[in-house]
């Protein structure tokens, strides 16, 4: 008799990443009978919510429901109706909401309550919204990329199933750049993690991992730019800020009230004799780089070595996956290739930043001007952060892999978060039972 395929027995999960600049919804799918296997969960959909991050709704919470509608309705379409009630939904908010909570716990709670109210009214198994810690964000990003790269699998393979795979069980470090924070997470080589706050211990699939992680709040690309502007306007002689991080000919008016709205600029706040100032781009990579370096305090370190601002950082070890804005920015600049050396990246940035704004606008006519105008800063910031902040060198640069997706799933903290909350990463290696799950009868 002919073998007949059984109906697909799958499960789904939804995670919303409520970032500082926007919210994204991810739908994951996996075979129900293989929940504890490594590498079986994959992303089937990403939906980017139109609009800003949820922290921007603090004065208009009644608009949150409409804001989330399109992506939640998309989830209803993608996931079969019969699975809706069993599909868990999680929302994790990151540094944008951490900053709002620093300003006002009450306002942050109001936003989260209204977000929860909106998400509770869909026919899924909503599990709540919360602000995840920077440590969690780093840890879940590290879990995600290593899960997708097959690093937790105990089976050694003679062939490579994913890009970047070095065919050993050495885990990749994770470098995550958001709008409001940045995370660095990796397993140091035989190095004591000198600060307990930066140490994580995991037992995954029967193996112990001692992981270093740190999240630098206010050092995401958007907040870093606000910091830089607040620092530089302090020494401006008038309401004109000649800024090397913007293209020559670029002009933009900034409200001082907007500049000082974020807790990230508090350390630079001063009474200015004007309410607005104008950024005038001069497009000079070297000067931009120098200005950015002033955001990193490297004069103080209470440990054997530090990243910046007195934060312990062990010696870098192994390969790193750089994702989120690290990837988006470098992809736009066409600098994600493994073959591009750090020196070449710096040269390309020098040329890019020096290009006149009118020329840039013509070359990238399809890109929103707000984003387009900031790529010179963002690219320079990435180089500064990786080289001076985290102490990558021209030699170790080749160990950084700019990653958007792995096996069709976005690199980022959301998959690791869901794997953890659904208990899909066992502490011990599951017993191999190859004959217990037959696909055909």
């Amino acid at each position: 008799t002919q073998n007949k395929a059984l109906p697909e027995n799958v499960k789904y999960g939804i995670v919303l990443d409520a970032g500082s600049s926007h919210t994204s919804l991810y739908i994951y799918k996996w075979p129900a009978e293989k929940e504890n296997d490594t590498g079986v969960v994959h992303q089937v959909e990403e939906c980017r919510v139109k609009g800003p991050g949820i922290s921007k709704f603090v004065q208009k919470v009644n608009e949150i429901g409409i804001y989330l509608t399109d992506c939640m309705e998309r989830a209803r379409e993608v996931i079969p109706r019969s699975q809706h009630q069993e599909t868990p939904v999680y929302l994790g908010a990151t540094a944008g909401m951490r900053l709002l909570r620093m300003e006002s716990e009450e306002l942050a709670d109001r936003v989260l309550d209204v977000v929860e109210r909106s998400l509770s009214n869909y026919p899924f198994d909503f599990q709540g919204a919360r602000i995840i810690t920077g440590q969690e964000e780093g840890a879940y990003g590290w879990i995600t990329i290593n899960y997708l790269l097959g690093k937790f699998s105990q089976k050694t393979r003679w062939f490579s199933i994913v890009p970047y795979e070095t065919n050993n069980q050495e885990t990749f470090g994770a470098l995550d750049l958001g709008g409001a924070s940045t995370q660095v997470t990796f397993v140091p080589q035989n190095q004591t993690i000198e600060s307990p706050d930066n140490a994580l211990q995991f037992r995954l699939y029967g193996k112990d991992y001692n992981v270093y992680t740190h999240s630098f709040l206010c050092y995401g690309k958007d907040q870093a730019l606000w910091q830089k502007l607040a620092k530089d306007i302090q020494v401006a002689s008038n309401e004109i800020l000649r800024d090397p991080c913007f293209h020559p000919g670029y002009k933009k008016v900034v409200n001082v009230s907007d500049l000082y709205k974020t807790p990230c600029t508090k350390r630079f706040e001063m009474t200015l004799p004007f309410q607005q100032f104008e950024i005038q781009g001069i497009g000079n990579y070297q000067q931009c780089h120098q200005s950015i370096l002033e955001l990193f305090n490297t004069s103080y370190c209470p440990y054997s070595q530090c990243a910046f601002n007195g934060i312990f950082l062990p010696p870098l070890q192994g390969d790193f996956g750089a994702f989120s804005a690290f990837y988006f920015v470098m992809k736009f600049l066409n600098l994600t290739s493994e073959k591009v050396s750090q020196e070449k990246v710096t040269e390309m940035m020098k040329k890019f930043c020096a290009q006149p704004w009118e020329e840039i606008k013509t070359s990238y006519a399809g890109v929103k001007e707000k984003y387009l105008s900031e790529y010179c800063f963002s690219g320079t910031y990435i180089l500064s952060l990786l080289l001076q902040g985290y102490h990558f060198t021209a030699d170790s640069w080749e160990h950084i892999h700019f990653i958007g997706k792995i096996q069709g799933s976005d690199a980022g903290w959301t998959l690791g978060y869901m794997l953890n909350l659904t208990n899909m990463i066992p502490a011990e290696q599951p017993l191999s039972t190859p004959l217990s799950h037959s696909t055909y009868v």
Epitope: D109, L112, D113, V114, E116, R117, S120, N121, P123
Partner: antibody, heavy 119, light 107 residues
Framework: EVQLVESGGALVQPGRSLRLSCAVS????????VHWVRQAPGKGLEWVAV???????DYNAAFMSRFTISKDNSKNTVYLQMNSLRADDTAVYYC?????????????WGQGTTVTVSS | DIVMTQSQKFMSTSVGDRVSITCKAS??????VAWYQQKPGQSPKLLIY???YRYSGVPDRFTGSGSGTDFTLTISNMQSEDLADYFC?????????FGGGTKLEIK
């Protein structure tokens, strides 16, 4: 087992105040929202107010100036403070738990407490 | 405010009947509608949410349908224990509003 028990209902004169309590068990107020819904004699249901798990509140505009919802997580109790009561506030008042974390439909209701406003 | 209208205040039924109770919203509420059953002297019980999703433990003879402005609660095989008031509720926007109720009676 999830339970909500209302208390505090009474016969009061117009213009007076009353505080209703809703003692909950089987779930925690830090994990779920609680609503107050009322039902006038022989009438349908009317939504009054909600308090969500972090303490945010919303009201039916018809009651906003006179009624206040609050909670004490440590006592597992939600309150409805009702001021300037009128004859048309006469009803059975129910507290109800959100079916999902903070949803606007209700999977468990209390047995109700009767408020009669009359001179 | 969104008005939820249950045009039939009373419906006469017999055991075994297929009964359909309707509810109309004054404006589009998507599928943000719940149905409750209330027996005399008791508090309401949730039957259906999101217009068509049966709440756990509710017998499968109860089904909900509709979207936008028109909604129906159907009891496919009326039982004597189903004699009660039935209310629809919209939760698409605040204030939450209920229909006036439909009372099922025996013929």
């Amino acid at each position: 087992e999830v339970q909500l028990v209302e208390s505090g209902g009474a016969l009061v004169q117009p213009g007076r105040s009353l505080r209703l309590s809703c003692a909950v068990s089987g779930f925690t107020l830090s994990n779920y929202g609680v609503h107050w819904v009322r039902q006038a004699p022989g009438k349908g249901l009317e939504w009054v107010a909600v308090i969500l798990r972090r303490g945010s509140t919303d009201y039916n505009a018809a009651f906003m100036s006179r009624f206040t919802i609050s909670k004490d997580n440590s006592k597992n109790t939600v309150y409805l403070q009702m001021n300037s009561l009128r004859a048309d506030d006469t009803a059975v008042y129910y507290c109800a738990k959100t079916a999902v974390v903070a949803g606007d439909y209700f999977d468990y209701w209390g047995q109700g407490t009767t408020v009669t406003v009359s001179s | 405010d969104i008005v939820m209208t249950q045009s039939q205040k009373f419906m006469s039924t017999s055991v075994g009947d297929r009964v359909s109770i309707t509810c109309k919203a004054s404006q589009n509420v998507g599928t943000n509608v719940a149905w409750y059953q209330q027996k005399p002297g008791q508090s309401p019980k949730l039957l259906i949410y999101s217009a068509s999703y049966r709440y756990s433990g509710v017998p499968d003879r109860f089904t909900g349908s509709g979207s936008g402005t028109d909604f129906t609660l159907t009891i496919s095989n009326m039982q004597s224990e189903d004699l009660a008031d039935y209310f629809c509720q919209q939760y698409n926007s605040y204030p939450l509003t209920f229909g006036g109720g439909t009372k099922l009676e025996i013929k």
